[in-house]
């Protein structure tokens, strides 16, 4: 028996269902009584789901897995994983035994989009050109860790005086907080882009500082 899986990782959004595809080619006259199918975590060998002795033995993994019972006889050994969590990420091995056996591993990559960034400015009043301000760009509930990029109003990348921190929340998703310290010009727009590297999703936030006096305050 030869087991086939997709070589590319399966990308699944948090809280959605994912299918880990696995197939084999049954011989003529094949019956499910001959089939031993085991899904397990590749690294720890923890049992996830199994079909043995002619019947579905059910989920051994938080009761969120299922096979496609009507398709097994056709060689479809795929596994359905419901309500995906970040902790589900990793490699899963599909092990098929009929007379002989074969196995193959499929990788599950979990992802969650980042929220539209919120921008805060400190100090946020009595600003003058030449003041040093702190701009914080915060985006929430994403996975995996984000990349953050800053630009000024002309689209020029701002790389100095940036501190980016990732804080995992209760669900293991990430909140990203990026702080830019910049000396104000007369007018200025500052943009942050939060990128999810797996989803190639970009979330944009910007702050425009206007209405300040256009001249620097007189020297004392």
């Amino acid at each position: 028996v030869e087991v086939q899986v997709s070589e590319d990782p399966v990308v699944a959004l948090v809280d959605t269902d994912a299918t880990l595809r696995c197939s084999f080619s049954p011989e003529p006259g094949f019956s499910l009584a001959q089939l031993n199918l085991i899904w397990q975590l590749t690294d720890t060998k923890q049992l996830v789901h199994s079909f043995t002795e002619g019947r579905d033995q059910g989920s051994a993994y938080s009761n969120r897995t299922a096979l496609f019972p009507d398709l097994l006889v056709q060689g479809n050994a795929s596994l359905r994983l419901q309500r995906v969590r970040v902790t589900d990420e990793g490699s899963y091995t599909c092990f098929v035994s009929i007379q002989d056996f074969d196995s193959a591993a499929v990788s599950l990559q979990v992802a969650a989009p980042y929220s539209k960034p919120s921008m805060t400015l400190e100090p946020n009043k009595d600003l003058r050109p030449g003041n040093m301000v702190t701009i914080t760009c915060s985006s929430y509930q994403g996975y995996p860790e984000a990349e953050v990029f800053w630009k000024d109003g002309q689209g020029v990348p701002l790389t100095g005086n940036v501190t980016t921190s990732q804080m995992a929340n209760e669900r293991g998703l990430f909140d990203v907080h990026s702080v830019l310290r910049v000396v104000l010009g007369a007018n200025g727009t500052y943009s942050c882009l939060v990128r999810n590297p797996v989803l190639q999703q970009d979330a944009h936030g910007s702050v425009t500082i206007t209405g300040q006096p256009l001249t620097f305050p007189p020297e004392a």
Epitope: T87, E89, E122, T134, T136, S138, T164
Partner: antibody, heavy 117, light 111 residues
Framework: EVKLVESGGGLVQPGGSLKLSCAAS????????MSWVRQTPEKRLEWVAS???????YYPDSMKGRFTISRDNARNILYLQMSSLKSEDTAMYYC???????????WGQGTLVTVSA | DIVLTQSPASLAVSLGQRATISCRAS??????????MHWYQQKPGQPPKLLIY???NLESGVPARFSGSGSGTDFTLNIHPVEEEDAATYYC?????????FGGGTKLEIK
């Protein structure tokens, strides 16, 4: 040189309140997430709170509602307002500068809070 | 909450030998990118000091005799060769999800 100096600890009765301060120097205070971590008399370490900016804070469930973290970026000071204190809150309270993935890179010397009748 | 269990609670190691401290998490603190486990040293009367972050990265200024390894649920701090000044209590801490928690500590004595 990064320097964090806590103050405000002392003896307080159960149900009472206390406000701790942490004066920071030697780094750009406003750029960093700041945290409070405490150490019980049994030497157990517990994360208390973290703050990104004035409106972005994080707490463990056990501290929510009773403890409030805040900061004054103009004066480089971190605060921890504690209320409805219990004997279990007796600990050395440390101010810490958080690293980029929530480790605690720099610690102050701590201020001792004792909750007792 | 993720519970971190350190072992042993205490150990005595001869000068110049290897000290190995284990930290086991009640669930994985790793992703495909990082292991969110950190190690601290605390001497009597002093605050904790960061030694290792993200499982294996040596904090600036920390001697190279300290090293960290591990992923998933099992992590190790190694000190080799042990020096007299390494007598202290060592703590692990994770930052994989809220709340961030610490291990109970391992007290290292130098023989």
């Amino acid at each position: 040189e990064v320097k964090l100096v806590e103050s405000g600890g002392g003896l307080v009765q159960p149900g009472g309140s206390l406000k701790l301060s942490c004066a920071a120097s030697g780094f750009t205070f406003s750029s960093y997430i700041m945290s409070w971590v405490r150490q019980t008399p049994e030497k157990r370490l517990e994360w208390v709170a973290s703050i990104v900016s004035s409106n972005i804070t994080y707490y463990p469930d056990s501290m929510k509602g009773r403890f409030t973290i805040s900061r004054d970026n103009a004066r480089n000071i971190l605060y921890l307002q504690m209320s409805s204190l219990k004997s279990e809150d007796t600990a050395m309270y440390y101010c810490a500068r958080s690293g980029t993935r929530a480790w605690f890179a720099y610690w102050g010397q701590g201020t001792l809070v004792t909750v007792s009748a | 909450d993720i519970v971190l269990t350190q072992s042993p609670a205490s150990l005595a190691v001869s000068l110049g030998q290897r000290a190995t401290i284990s930290c086991r998490a009640s669930k994985s603190v790793s992703t495909s990118a990082y292991s969110y486990m950190h190690w601290y040293q605390q001497k009597p009367g002093q605050p904790p000091k960061l030694l290792i972050y993200l499982a294996s990265n040596l904090e600036s200024g920390v001697p190279a005799r300290f090293s960290g390894s591990g992923s998933g649920t099992d992590f190790t701090l190694n000190i080799h060769p042990v020096e007299e000044e390494d007598a202290a209590t060592y703590y692990c801490q994770h930052s994989r999800e809220l709340p961030y928690t610490f291990g109970g500590g391992t007290k290292l004595e130098i023989k």
